[in-house]
């Protein structure tokens, strides 16, 4: 089953770890109040303490199943032979308002379980209606969801969920908005937020698209809410570059997708190509992203307020090999303000009757934009025309850091005392710690100041999550969760080494002659008691 916490990390003090030797790990979430860690895996859901001791394990598989059985065998007898089938956890979300965990798997056409947070007791497993089947695709890192709580004391919670469908467009929408009921056994659970004969809260990949491009699918890498919008970062087959000939080379494009939270008919659907470029090299394969707030310094440099959202992203080079992308990759920065502005400009242009809707995978014809006098502001959520809308120009991010050797796979970020720290997981199992400062001398917008091993030789998976107190970073590989301290100031034994490290967390604590955080140093606010700048070392 699951191993005990054990030592890790090279010359660092041992990191706390949780090992799961039998079952591959897929997803990780951290409870923002308790700090407890929930881990999704193949056939298991784990609950761990903040220091990674195992508190509970819940078995989700294997189950007797066959991917061809629709509906699943638990609902209707199936002519296909059943076999022991792994249940891969594909979505793991905390529903704070209902004190439950939503865990969606690959088995039984992609049904979800609701587990009580305290003890992982199964509260419900809706599985008898077609709306309960999200997708039978087994790939763990291809589905993303955002849970939207209902207005306090009233209103419905809902789940926005995106998933690949493996050609089964008659069974599964690629993107949908579902009702989340308080009672797990409620018949309306996972029902579409809106549905009539013509429109509903879902997008299906049209059968014509799949006829022409049988490999066409959309892979959902990251999703988040910002203001009144839900966004997805996706990878999809590029139908402009890929030949319909199945034997031809496949090219992929990264898209940012946006919907209004309160748009049950999906009239606000917009997608734009997204990527970044550095020294003539295009980085177009999105690997991970992380929504954050800029530190005071970065906000000032970007001309943003400190409470505005920014998006840190990792892109691999080029447009080929989605599953095994090139090692060369880039950490890039987008501001939501710029993304919103680009989208608004495109909508405004379309409502002036300029151009076409430009969404070939979704529309079976090149619909022209309709001229209309409507005022399009930042909050515009669409009409029943000029939708769905595709961007024709790539939204380009600011490249911060390029890794040519290891390959960046995951990203997280936070603001430490006004400075922006980014953590990037790599293909070799390392965590790179990066200080983002657009005013760096020499014009380098980011400085990689430390690299630590989480698990040697195993790629860091996407769910790189900070503990609620921002003291630790939880990094996950297929077999292990590692708790990495955000700083290891104590490893630096002199003032010069301490401040020469450029770790923004670290300063020289004069009273104890140790390198530490400011808040760990007695009388740090008194003059000459805490050195935060290399020049101060000489003075001390």
């Amino acid at each position: 089953e699951a191993g005990l916490p054990r030592a890790g990390g090279g010359s660092q003090p041992p990191f706390r770890t949780f090992s799961a030797s039998d079952w591959g790990l897929t997803h990780l979430v951290v409870h923002e109040q308790t700090g407890e860690v929930y881990v999704g895996a193949v056939n298991r859901i784990y609950k761990l303490s903040g220091n990674l001791t195992l508190l509970r394990a819940h078995v989700t598989g294997p189950v007797e199943d066959n991917e061809k059985c629709y509906p699943p065998p638990s609902v209707q007898s199936c002519p296909h032979g059943l076999g022991s089938t792994d249940n891969v956890n594909k979505l793991l979300l905390l529903d704070y308002a209902a004190n439950r965990l939503l865990a969606c798997g690959s088995a039984s056409q992609g049904i979800c379980q609701f587990l009580r947070l305290d003890d992982l007791f199964k509260l419900g497993e809706p599985h008898h209606r077609k709306e309960h089947y999200l997708s039978s695709v087994q790939e763990a890192g291809s589905m993303a969801g955002v849970l939207i709580a209902g207005p306090p004391g009233q209103g419905q919670a809902k789940l926005f969920v995106g998933t690949p469908i493996d050609g089964k467009s008659e069974y599964f929408p690629t993107l949908s908005s579902r009702r989340l009921m308080a009672n797990e056994e409620d018949a309306d659970m996972f029902g579409f937020v809106y549905q009539d004969e013509f429109v509903s809260s879902q997008l299906k990949i049209p059968s014509d698209t799949l006829s022409k491009f049988p490999a066409f699918d959309i892979y959902y890498v990251y999703s988040f809410r910002s203001e009144q919008f839900v966004y997805y970062l996706t990878l999809q087959l590029d139908t402009q570059l890929t030949s319909p000939d199945a034997a031809g080379e496949h090219f992929f494009t990264s898209k940012i997708v946006r919907l209004c939270v309160d748009d049950p008919k999906f009239y606000s659907y917009v997608e734009f190509p997204i990527g970044c470029e550095q020294a003539g090299v295009e980085y177009r394969l999105v690997q991970d992203a992380y929504l954050s707030r800029p530190g005071r310094a970065l906000a000032h440099q970007l001309g943003l307020a400190e409470d505005e959202d920014v998006l840190f992203t990792v892109f691999a080079q080029g447009q080929k090999n989605r599953v095994k992308p090139p090692k060369e990759s880039a950490l890039c920065l987008f501001t939501l303000r710029a993304i919103k502005e680009k989208i608004k400009e495109r909508i405004q242009s379309c409502y002036r009757g300029e151009g076409k809707l430009s969404l070939p995978w979704l529309l079976n014809k090149e619909l022209g934009c309709i001229n209309s006098p409507l005022q399009i502001d930042d909050d515009f959520c669409g009409q029943d025309f000029n939708q769905p809308l595709g961007g024709t120009v790539t939204i380009e991010g600011t490249p911060l850091f390029v890794d040519k050797d290891d390959g960046l796979t995951a990203v997280a970020a936070y603001d430490y005392r006004g400075r922006t720290v980014v953590f990037a997981g790599t293909r070799s199992g390392r965590i790179r710690k990066i200080l983002v400062d657009l005013s760096n001398p020499g014009g380098r917008p980011a400085l990689a100041y430390e690299s630590v091993v989480a698990q040697e030789g195993s790629p860091i998976l996407r769910d790189l999550v900070l503990s609620p107190n921002h003291q630790y970073l939880y990094a996950m590989t297929e077999k292990q969760v590692t708790r990495v301290p955000v700083e290891s100031c104590v490893q630096y034994t002199s003032c010069e080494l301490c401040l020469g490290s450029r770790d923004p967390h670290c300063g020289w604590c004069v009273l104890h002659s140790i390198c530490s955080r400011r808040d760990a140093c007695e009388r740090a606010d008194e003059p000459q008691r805490f050195a935060a700048d290399l020049l101060q070392c000489v003075q001390l």
């Epitope: 009539d196 001229n371 025309f385």
Partner: antibody, heavy 119, light 108 residues
Framework: EVQLVQSGAEVKKPGASVKVSCKAS????????ISWVRQAPGQGLEWMGW????????NYAQKLQGRVTMTTDTSTSTAYMELRSLRSDDTAVYYC????????????WGKGTMVTVSS | SYELTQPPSVSVSPGQTASITCSGD??????ACWYQQKPGQSPVLVIY???KRPSGIPERFSGSNSGNTATLTISGTQAMDEADYYC???????????FGGGTKLTVL
């Protein structure tokens, strides 16, 4: 059953105004728009405009801009169409229709209201 | 302003296939709808989004749209299909919905 029930026939003098009502039932009124279409005797259909019952946005046919006003009352699930400065060529059957969307057409129609403009 | 042109009348024998055309500039770049109107009655939507049938509309009604022409096809035409048929699309420059002039279908 989804229904649109329109007000009764009207006879008006040239230069006057007419206001036709359309009461919806059997569906969530604010989930759809209402289009207004007219048909002069022995003639074809002419689209007059559309109003969103969700947010009140309107789009009027260019030919009628300035003479037509469409409104809704969500509390009674009723749509209204007012046409001003009536002329004899405004004599027609006026239909309200549930607007399913630009791409989907008008899927439920009222029975029509005959408006006669005559001096 | 955008115009849709339909033949004033089409005749067909019972059981045969009737085709009613609707032409307009680059109509294939828009979605076309078709309405049936019997004498003294309100119009009924029979085809939307070029090819789709609303619930309750018989399978013998089908639609297509490409280039400059949309076509409503009624296979195995019945006497009850005798009616006026209107196509409808939109004017991209004004957002107006536009109807064709209508076609009277006579089942001989």
């Amino acid at each position: 059953e989804v229904q649109l029930v329109q007000s009764g026939a009207e006879v008006k003098k040239p230069g006057a105004s007419v206001k036709v009502s359309c009461k919806a039932s059997g569906y969530t009124f604010t989930s759809y728009g209402i289009s207004w279409v007219r048909q002069a005797p022995g003639q074809g259909l002419e689209w007059m405009g559309w109003i969103s019952a969700y947010n009140g946005n309107t789009n009027y046919a260019q030919k009628l801009q300035g003479r037509v006003t469409m409104t809704t009352d969500t509390s009674t699930s009723t749509a209204y169409m007012e046409l001003r400065s009536l002329r004899s060529d405004d004599t027609a059957v006026y239909y309200c229709a549930r607007h399913a969307g630009y791409y989907y057409g008008m899927d439920v129609w009222g029975k029509g209201t005959m408006v006669t403009v005559s001096s | 302003s955008y115009e849709l042109t339909q033949p004033p009348s089409v005749s067909v024998s019972p059981g045969q296939t009737a085709s009613i055309t609707c032409s307009g500039d680059k109509l294939g770049d828009k979605y076309a709808c078709w309405y049936q109107q019997k004498p003294g009655q309100s119009p009924v939507l029979v085809i939307y989004q070029d090819t789709k049938r609303p619930s309750g509309i018989p399978e013998r009604f089908s639609g297509s749209n490409s280039g400059n022409t949309a076509t409503l096809t009624i296979s195995g035409t019945q006497a009850m299909d005798e009616a006026d048929y209107y196509c409808q699309a939109w004017d991209s420059s004004t957002a107006d919905r536009v109807f064709g002039g209508g076609t009277k279908l006579t089942v001989l």
